[in-house]
Amino acid sequence: KGMHVAQPAVVLASSRGVASFVCEYGSSGNAAEVRVTVLRQAGSQMTEVCAATYTVEDELAFLDDSTCTGTSSGNKVNLTIQGLRAMDTGLYICKVELMYPPPYYVGMGNGTQIYVIDPEPCPDSD
Amino acid sequence: KGMHVAQPAVVLASSRGVASFVCEYGSSGNAAEVRVTVLRQAGSQMTEVCAATYTVEDELAFLDDSTCTGTSSGNKVNLTIQGLRAMDTGLYICKVELMYPPPYYVGMGNGTQIYVIDPEPCPDSD
């Protein structure tokens, strides 16, 4: 039986290419270490966008070169994906793993459809 | 029962606030005069965005002050809504009426969710 993970159905990226959404998991007990992965689904293909492991005491930490940032509060994770372009429009799935202590649990959300519109270029200043 | 009307589920407005989609109706016979209405649904409320009557021979013509433009080809109508802002994000329903000759037919699509993102203002040129 998988762990329930909830995420919004649709999110619009800002005109600067930034999209934020909350990923909430059904906490089963007192997980001390949680891993959150954002996957992009295209057809039957899944590609990893970013991932982070955090402990309940510490802040959520993505790698420095990651397109994602995030904060956590209890069983909610606030995820932000940056640098999005129109071609990045798609379904982004939040995967949550309760890593430690045992038992291990994993759950995946139904995905958040992120829509991205490329901004019009600003006119050149004369 | 009733005439079938098809329209896309989702459309993104451009950064200039322009959204286009095709509304296609299941033509029953030889309608010479067709009326197309775009309605915006908010809750149980429907408000008319724009409407136009066209004859199969002529081009689709919206009122001069309308936020919509359109072209028609057979039983397909290409609709464009302009001047959209983020607050206009919502469900836009295409209603098609075969007005003349009798019999009268009416059909409504399931709606197109139009997402609109306001652009970032361009920096002032010094």
Partner: antibody, heavy 114, light 112 residues
């Protein structure tokens, strides 16, 4: 507010002629095809004639073909029904109706009797 | 002679639900042609309450609904109010007559 106001109904002798008018307001008249519907006590409701928005095409029920003429003047927002060779069975209240059945006028009574 | 058959009268109590049937043939209601329903008070013009089988014009309360099955169309009025007492007519296109056909009307009486 949409309004359709019919005028011209009268008491006529069989064989006579009459012209009904319907002045429209509150909507873009030139964008809508229009119809005349009549209601006689013994015959119920009947769509008599229809016309497209531009006035270039018309439709008539068999009972009035060759006797009635539907026309419109979009500049005056007015729909007409010219009724010739009137018969007893044309006695009815005549309503002006938008062709999608959305609005009806209040009606005008035409009585044909010798 | 009306082509669509309606009961001459129906009655129901305030707050109750009532249905009015409109039976046609394969060349009209059963042929997939849109059905309209009209409400008429004495001395007044008809008012369309349902168009295109089940659509309500703006201003018509959602107590009025309609459906079609086979050659019969049905108007349902729920939560009856005193002001619903009126004549109700149905209409549809008839393909063999190439004309609109109407029902003879149903007088709705509110009891109590």
């Amino acid at each position: 507010e949409v309004q359709l106001v019919e005028t011209g109904g009268d008491l006529m002798k069989p064989g006579g002629s009459l012209r009904l008018s319907c002045v429209a307001s509150g909507f873009t008249f030139s964008s809508y095809s229009m119809s005349w519907v009549r209601q006689a006590p013994e015959k119920g409701l009947q769509l008599v004639a229809g016309i497209n928005s531009g006035g270039s095409s018309t439709y008539y029920t068999d009972a009035v073909k060759g006797r009635f003429t539907i026309s419109r003047d979009n500049a005056k927002n007015t729909l007409y029904l010219q009724m010739n060779s009137l018969r007893d069975e044309d006695t009815a209240v005549y309503y002006c109706v938008i062709s999608n059945w959305s609005y009806w006028g209040q009606g005008t009574l035409v009585t044909v009797s010798s | 002679q009306p082509v669509l058959t309606q009961p001459p009268s129906v009655s129901a109590a305030l707050g109750q639900r009532v249905t009015i049937s409109c039976t046609g043939t394969a060349t009209n209601v059963g042929g997939g042609y849109d059905v309209q329903w009209y409400q008429q008070f004495p001395g007044r013009p008809p008012k369309t309450i349902i168009y295109g089988n089940y659509n309500r014009p703006s201003g018509v309360p959602d107590r009025f609904s309609a459906s079609t099955s086979g050659t019969t169309a049905t108007l349902t009025i729920s939560g009856l109010q005193a002001e619903d007492e009126a004549n109700y007519y149905c209409s549809s296109w008839d393909n063999s007559l190439t004309a609109y056909v109407f029902g003879s009307g149903t007088q709705l009486t509110i009891l109590g």
